[in-house]
Amino acid sequence: EGAAQSNNSLMLQTSKENHTLASNSLCMDEKQITQNHSKVLAEVNISWPVQMARNAVLCCPPIEFRNLIVITWEIILRGQPSCTKSYRKETNETKETNCTDERITWVSTPDQNSDLQIHPVAITHDGYYRCIMATPDGNFHRGYHLQVLVTPEVTLFESRNRTAVCKAVAGKPAAQISWIPAGDCAPTEQEYWGNGTVTVKSTCHWEGHNVSTVTCHVSHLTGNKSLYIELLPVPGAKKSAKLY
């Protein structure tokens, strides 16, 4: 009964989204075409965290279209054969090999736009995406290590007297949990799910009668969230003199 009662007094504190992750494109302005190819080559690999259910646009190196021979997107997803999407300018021909995910497409026709879009991003889209642009001067490429982020569901309840449990369920990557005030906490438990998400559970006890409300703060790449709950009274306690 204590858990149910305590659950009733659960209060949402904050849910702040990290808007730096809301951007769905890392594409450079195509007007600012880099003439210095060494600069392009210096930008070979980009690590990019993207929130699940958003749309993502991945871009090729900014090479002038007139210099192109072939554009190839190579997509390597976990547990799947490598998928390639290519476009040959001379024949205006597109070709796909081992590509089964309909959510990964060219933004428009490759002769108009070489960018790749994922619409919407799913947890299975974790992987490596590389654009290879073949020109008479050689091949130029840009790679993305795409890390799909999943916002954890946060719960807080009092499991027994003055012991609270905070869970960050099915987040990716694992969330971090902290408490105000600090309690006597068991080691944090982590449960790994087959889809790459992690549930983190923190259980803490507060002996001090002067602790009225505890706050569980969950830190995650998708944003932070806090919940707070007033602890139930100590069993058998009727009246406190000065408990603080």
Epitope: S9, M11, P181, S212, L232, K238
Partner: antibody, heavy 114, light 107 residues
Framework: EVQLVQSGAEVKKPGASVKVSCKAS????????MHWVRQAPGQGLEWMGN????????NYDEKFQGRVTMTADTSTSTVYMELSSLRSEDTAVYYC???????WGRGTLVTVSS | DIQMTQSPSSLSVSVGDRVTITCQAS??????LHWFQQKPGKAPKLLIS???NLESGVPSRFSGSGSGTEFTFTISSLQPEDAATYYC?????????FGQGTKLEIK
């Protein structure tokens, strides 16, 4: 939506007692701490204590220890705050609040005057 | 007891200006808090719960930030109806304690 309805204004003589009531609705009465806060004219807010209706557990601020009594009637979802040995400096508006301080009553003015 | 030091105690500001009020918990003890607005003859009205959560129906010009022992309440663009006294309340430890209040006047 939680509603806290408080009893009406009181005028008391020094040395007397006053009992203010606060009737709650819109939430599980026995599952939330109820707090009392007072505010003297032109002054700030002062926490007096709290009661957990589900068990009758109470905490009183040391300043009011021995003069204040908080009780709860679960049949009517009402909490009471009784303050005894009243003095002029107890003239104040008394508020009940719940839901971790997010829901407040409108207040009860208690005037202590000879 | 945790003392909440609120500053400034009063300020006079023009409409459209930005207002910042701070609350600091004593003893370096991390706490959680609410921010209230009180107008004469009225009960305090909760604006920000849990340090930074804007309550439903409260205009977005009000915001709260901070954690641990230092907290800030901000009005981004002061409106005439914002003239009131503002209080912070720490609700982590018994006894709950309020800041001394900040009386905000419109120039």
């Amino acid at each position: 939506e939680v509603q806290l309805v408080q009893s009406g204004a009181e005028v008391k003589k020094p040395g007397a007692s006053v009992k203010v009531s606060c009737k709650a609705s819109g939430h599980t009465f026995t599952s939330y701490w109820m707090h009392w806060v007072r505010q003297a004219p032109g002054q700030g807010l002062e926490w007096m204590g709290n009661i957990y209706p589900g068990s009758g557990s109470i905490n009183y601020d040391e300043k009011f220890q021995g003069r204040v009594t908080m009780t709860a009637d679960t049949s009517t979802s009402t909490v009471y705050m009784e303050l005894s040995s009243l003095r002029s400096e107890d003239t104040a508006v008394y508020y009940c609040l719940t839901m971790t301080g997010t829901s407040w009553g409108r207040g009860t003015l208690v005037t202590v005057s000879s | 007891d945790i003392q909440m030091t609120q500053s400034p105690s009063s300020l006079s500001v023009s409409v459209g200006d930005r207002v910042t009020i701070t609350c600091q918990a004593s003893q370096g003890t991390p706490i959680n808090l609410h921010w209230f607005q009180q107008k004469p003859g009225k009960a305090p009205k909760l604006l920000i719960s849990g340090a930074s959560n804007l309550e439903s129906g409260v205009p977005s010009r009000f915001s709260g930030s901070g954690s641990g022992t230092e907290f800030t309440f901000t009005i981004s663009s002061l409106q005439p109806e914002d003239a009131a006294t503002y209080y912070c309340l720490q609700f982590t430890y018994i006894p709950w304690t309020f800041g001394q209040g900040t009386k905000l006047e419109i120039k």
